[in-house]
């Protein structure tokens, strides 16, 4: 699925939906892009509890084990992000896998990513006839990270 | 920095370069989106070695620490992507920092980012009028985790 | 008009340092998508990248030479350097820099579309 | 680390006969970049992009390939074609130039 550019317009860059095409269905073939987090949602449950697994994907075998939680607006590229939730305030031991241990952290990694949204273009909010891809950044939890905490000078 | 969507062309999306504008600035502006990675980059030094901070970045306090390195392509958006390279084959032990832990493993954490490339479009290369913008997943380290060795069934 | 135009010390000592500079005109280093690489070619063989430096300062070098390179750039005299650690003598080659920046209707080139007339360096004891 | 294989190393051909040069990319790649060297004198771009012609290049050059395998064809060599040509590519991470070996044509 791609973006046709072509020279003439008064913006950069302007887009057109297609005529053959349902907008509607080709919006969402275009703006869907990837559905999945980075370890599949389908074994998620594991990481429910605080404690690390010794199977399953990683967010449920780290010791600052996360679940995911889908983040899904159908007027963004890419329409479904998903933000990693920590499901402990601390590490998990590596030992036990279970007990926590206060000397680390389990936090957040953010990551401001790049989405576009549809959007009326500005000052045609009546005509109907144009949208806007808007470019944004828009702050997302990659995964949990156990850290020492950090010690102030 | 938006892109222009407009009814009536033949191809979903169709877009235009800016007339008013120099491409390459414009093209830049739009395509350059954020270009730092989820931590300064200005403070990776911290995390070059395999230790665990205590200050610094969340990358540099991590016990499973790792650098970050730049992916540039002019020709995709985001240009700039950043893939975390893990310092420590283990985790470092939360007590001292420095020495490793054999009990758990520093391990990349991968995603599939949606990215849009630059393309010349599909049986127009000699026309120079048009160029398209292809989505693609690439695939990213996002950060290193501390995870508990997998144990086979 | 682009020019190009290397200078350098001619001989050096080994575990010396090369310094060379690159003069550039017809085009600005401050340009969006604009950049300048060094290139080197032992005599009778093949071309060698050595070092990437962008319009904003990011700089790129190759991975097996990174601990002894060293990019920078000068805007306002339109002069980028690079210098090399502790030359060896199969550091003995002609030394290019070229441009790379070139917007077509598809995107960026990642080829050297200018380069410089090369300046000859030798490593010798 | 891409490496790029070309091959032959060397070659000649007799004026009106067809040249082919090829390069091997040890993974895939999009594009390859090629570049003529004659002696004395600073490589000058040749073929953009896998095969656009830079400017001033006969149309008797032409270039094509894609994945791992790319070539440089002459349709029809003429003295002046003698050189040597290296293929080139960029690969953004790690952001690295890469170039072939290059091959030395000769006439015959």
């Known amino acids: 699925v791609s973006l046709r550019i072509q020279e003439g317009c008064s913006h950069l860059p302007s887009c057109c939906p297609s005529k053959e095409q349902e907008p509607p269905e080709e919006w969402l073939k275009w703006s869907s892009a990837s559905v999945s987090p980075p370890e599949p949602l389908s074994h998620t449950h594991h990481a429910e509890s605080c404690r690390a697994s010794k199977d399953g994907p990683l967010n449920s075998r780290a010791i600052s084990p996360w679940s995911y939680e889908l983040d899904r607006d159908l007027n963004r590229v890419p329409q479904d992000l998903y933000h990693a939730r920590c499901l402990c305030p601390h590490c998990v031991s590596l030992q036990t896998g279970s007990h926590m241990d206060p000397l680390g952290n389990s936090v957040p990694l953010y990551h401001n990513q790049t989405v576009f949204y549809r959007r009326p273009c500005h000052g045609e909010e009546g005509t109907h006839r144009r949208y806007c891809l808007e470019r944004r950044l828009y702050r997302v939890s990659l995964a949990c990270v156990c850290v020492r905490p950090r010690v102030m000078a | 920095v938006s892109l222009r969507i407009q009814e009536g062309c033949s191809h979903l999306p169709s877009c235009c370069p800016s007339k008013e504008q120099e491409p390459p600035e414009e093209w830049l502006k739009w395509s350059s989106a954020s270009v730092s990675p989820p931590e300064p980059l200005s403070h990776t030094h911290h995390a070059e070695s395999c230790r665990a901070s205590k200050d610094g970045p969340l990358n540099s306090r991590a016990i499973s620490p790792w650098s970050y390195e730049l992916d540039r392509d002019l020709n995709r958006v985001p240009q700039d992507l950043y893939h975390a390279r893990c310092l420590c084959p283990h985790c470092v032990s939360l007590q001292t920092g420095s020495h490793m832990d054999p009990l758990g493993n520093s391990v990349p954490l991968y995603h599939n980012q949606t990215v849009f490339y630059r393309r010349p479009c599909h049986g127009e290369e000699g026309t120079h009028r048009r160029y398209c913008l292809e989505r693609r997943l690439y695939r990213v380290s996002l950060a290193c985790v501390c995870v508990r060795p997998r144990v086979m069934a | 008009q682009v020019t190009l135009k290397e200078s350098g010390p001619g001989i050096l000592q080994p575990s010396q340092t090369l310094s060379l500079t690159c003069s550039f005109s017809g085009f600005s280093l401050s340009t969006s998508g604009m950049g300048l690489g060094w290139i080197r070619q032992p005599s009778g063989k093949g071309l060698e990248w050595l070092a990437h430096?962008?319009?904003?300062?990011?700089?790129h070098y190759k991975p097996a030479l990174k601990s002894r390179l060293t990019i920078s750039k000068d805007i306002s005299s339109s002069q980028v350097f690079l210098t090399i650690a502790s030359v060896d003598t199969a550091d003995t080659a002609t030394y290019y820099c070229a441009r790379m920046g070139q917007l077509h209707y598809y995107g960026y080139d990642y080829a050297m579309d200018y380069w410089g007339q090369g300046t000859s360096v030798t490593v010798s004891s | 680390q891409i490496v790029l294989t070309q091959s032959p190393a060397i070659m000649s051909a007799s004026p009106g006969e067809k040249v082919t040069i090829s390069c091997s990319a040890s993974?895939?790649?999009?594009?390859m970049y090629w570049y003529q060297q004659k002696p004395g004198s600073s490589p000058k771009p040749w073929i953009y992009?896998?095969?656009n012609l830079a400017s001033g290049v006969p149309a008797r050059f032409s270039g094509s390939g894609s994945g791992t395998s790319y070539s440089l064809t002459i349709s029809s060599m003429e003295a002046e074609d003698a050189a040597t040509y290296y293929c080139?590519?960029?690969?953004?991470?790690?952001?690295?130039?890469?170039f072939g070996g290059g091959t030395k044509l000769e006439i015959k």
């Open positions: 080139q590519l960029y690969h953004s991470y790690p952001p690295t130039w890469t």
């Open positions: 992009r896998t095969s």
């Open positions: 430096i962008w319009w904003d300062d990011v700089k």
């Open positions: 993974s895939s790649v999009s594009y």
